[in-house]
């Protein structure tokens, strides 16, 4: 089996963690988040070729069926395997609060 | 906000559970699985428009950034939110075993 972390499409083309710089306006948060003003959003982007970072047996099945029926079954997709928490200072009904969100920033990626 | 379960693209077009009939040969399992000979594979297929079955805050972020930078950031993707277990009768070095797999069949779907 091919190494699950070696991208056959060339460096950086397969499913991996990317960082996208975004303002509160970009994120659609300007009306409820006070800080930070900008966020380095980590997200999972890239192709999922056969055997590359397969999350589980379901991902293997999906790839095999995609090769058989590409019009019916899509290829596996690059999504977060886990997340990093982030704190936001946000507006609330009563004022301002500091709140932790556990599902904001991707920590690592796999193909599902 | 739009109902997170109402598909704006028309019935059946958005992220949902589909069943795909597959043989052991289709799945690439013929050399190690004895039974069942055929599987009704449940998997997540469909589009992920804005606010549809968003799994978490990360999915919201991804959609907002996709609208801003469609060439850089892909839209959220339809993946399993949970799985149903399945038992397989499989060949082993010593003979035959009955094995449960927890990550084979999608149970329900969301957009990440």
């Amino acid at each position: 089996a091919r190494n699950g972390d070696r991208c056959p499409l060339g460096p950086g083309r397969c499913c991996r963690l990317h960082t996208v710089h975004a303002s509160l306006e970009d994120l659609g948060w300007a009306d409820w988040v006070l800080s930070p003003r900008e966020v380095q959003v980590t997200m999972c982007i890239g192709a999922c070729p056969s055997q590359f970072r397969e999350a589980n047996m379901h991902a293997q099945i999906k790839m095999n069926l995609h090769r058989l029926k590409p019009d019916t079954v899509p290829a596996p997709c690059c999504v977060p395997a886990s997340y990093n928490p982030m704190v936001l200072i946000q507006k609330t009904d009563t004022g301002v609060s500091l709140q932790t969100y556990d599902d904001l920033l991707a920590k690592d990626c796999h193909c599902v | 906000a739009r109902n997170g379960d109402r598909c704006p693209l028309g019935p059946g077009r958005c992220c949902r559970l589909h069943t795909v009939h597959a043989s052991l040969e289709d799945l690439g399992w013929a050399d190690w699985v004895l039974s069942p000979r055929e599987v009704q594979v449940t998997m997540c297929i469909g589009a992920c428009p804005s606010q549809f079955r968003e799994a978490n805050m990360h999915a919201q972020i991804k959609m907002n950034l996709h609208r801003l930078k469609p060439d850089t950031v892909p839209a959220p993707c339809c993946v399993p939110a949970s799985y149903n277990p399945m038992v397989l009768i499989q060949k082993t070095d010593t003979g035959v075993s009955l094995q449960t797999y927890d990550d084979l069949l999608a149970k329900d779907c969301h957009c990440v």
Epitope: L34, S35, E38, Q40, P85, V87, I89, S97, T100 | -
Partner: antibody, heavy 121, light 107 residues
Framework: QVQLVQSGAEVKKPGASVKVSCKAS????????ISWVRQAPGQGLEWMGW????????FYAQKLQGRVTMTTDTSTSTAYMELRSLRSDDTAVYYC??????????????WGQGTLVTVSS | DIQMTQSPSSVSASVGDRVTITCRAS??????LAWYQQKPGKAPKLLIY???SLQSGVPSRFSGSGSGTDFTLTISSLQPEDFATYYC?????????FGGGTKVEIK
């Protein structure tokens, strides 16, 4: 380089008010918040509150609610902290601190030199 | 409010010693903790943020660890300029709170 320069020492009578300024330079003032921290003689650090330099939204420590007001002047990149109805136990060194906020959370990465406020009759 | 308890309140040590200061939060704060050093008559200085990230310009003999409720600041080999008071700070929720401080003194 980032600098926070505070106004000079003050001596006030009980019941009076004091307004301490904190002039920021070396960064985009509206990109980060400002926190105010005080330290009574021989004591530890006490957080007084935070202000967004962008929106001017504030959070004040419960203990100081109704007596403290934090403001900013973006045209001069200056933050202000006013404390009213001063009491002797308000005698302290008052610090402003840039409140850096990113995906690694919050931290007070640059501090003013401190302003000694003495409340005495 | 989240209470931050530091121990010990003071420690006597010699140059070259390994010094460990602990900080306990009254409830879980993930890794949202910072450490500061303060010398007499000076403003505090940021050493560590996000429990274990070293602030730019701070010597690598300083390190932080922990998550949840229990945290540690370690000075691997105490230098003469490290004699000071150290404070932990939770930035998990408002109001932000500091520990009571640990004074590192010359033995």
């Amino acid at each position: 380089q980032v600098q926070l320069v505070q106004s000079g020492a003050e001596v006030k009578k009980p019941g009076a008010s004091v307004k301490v300024s904190c002039k920021a330079s070396g960064y985009t003032f509206t990109n980060e918040g400002i926190s105010w921290v005080r330290q009574a003689p021989g004591q530890g650090l006490e957080w007084m509150g935070w202000i967004s330099a962008y929106t001017a939204d504030t959070f004040y420590a419960q203990k100081l609610q109704g007596r403290v007001t934090m403001t900013t002047d973006t045209s001069t990149s200056t933050a202000y902290m006013e404390l009213r109805s001063l009491r002797s136990d308000d005698t302290a060194v008052y610090y402003c601190a840039r409140t850096r906020h990113d995906t690694s959370g919050l931290r007070f990465d640059y501090w003013g030199q401190g302003t000694l406020v003495t409340v005495s009759s | 409010d989240i209470q931050m308890t530091q121990s010990p309140s003071s420690v006597s040590a010699s140059v070259g010693d390994r010094v460990t200061i602990t900080c306990r939060a009254s409830q879980g704060i993930d890794s949202w903790l910072a450490w500061y050093q303060q010398k007499p008559g000076k403003a505090p200085k940021l050493l560590i943020y996000a429990a274990s990230s070293l602030q730019s310009g701070v010597p690598s003999r300083f390190s932080g660890s922990g998550s949840g409720t229990d945290f540690t600041l370690t000075i691997s080999s105490l230098q003469p300029e490290d004699f000071a008071t150290y404070y932990c700070q939770q930035v998990h929720s408002f109001p932000i709170t500091f520990g009571g401080g640990t004074k590192v003194e010359i033995k």
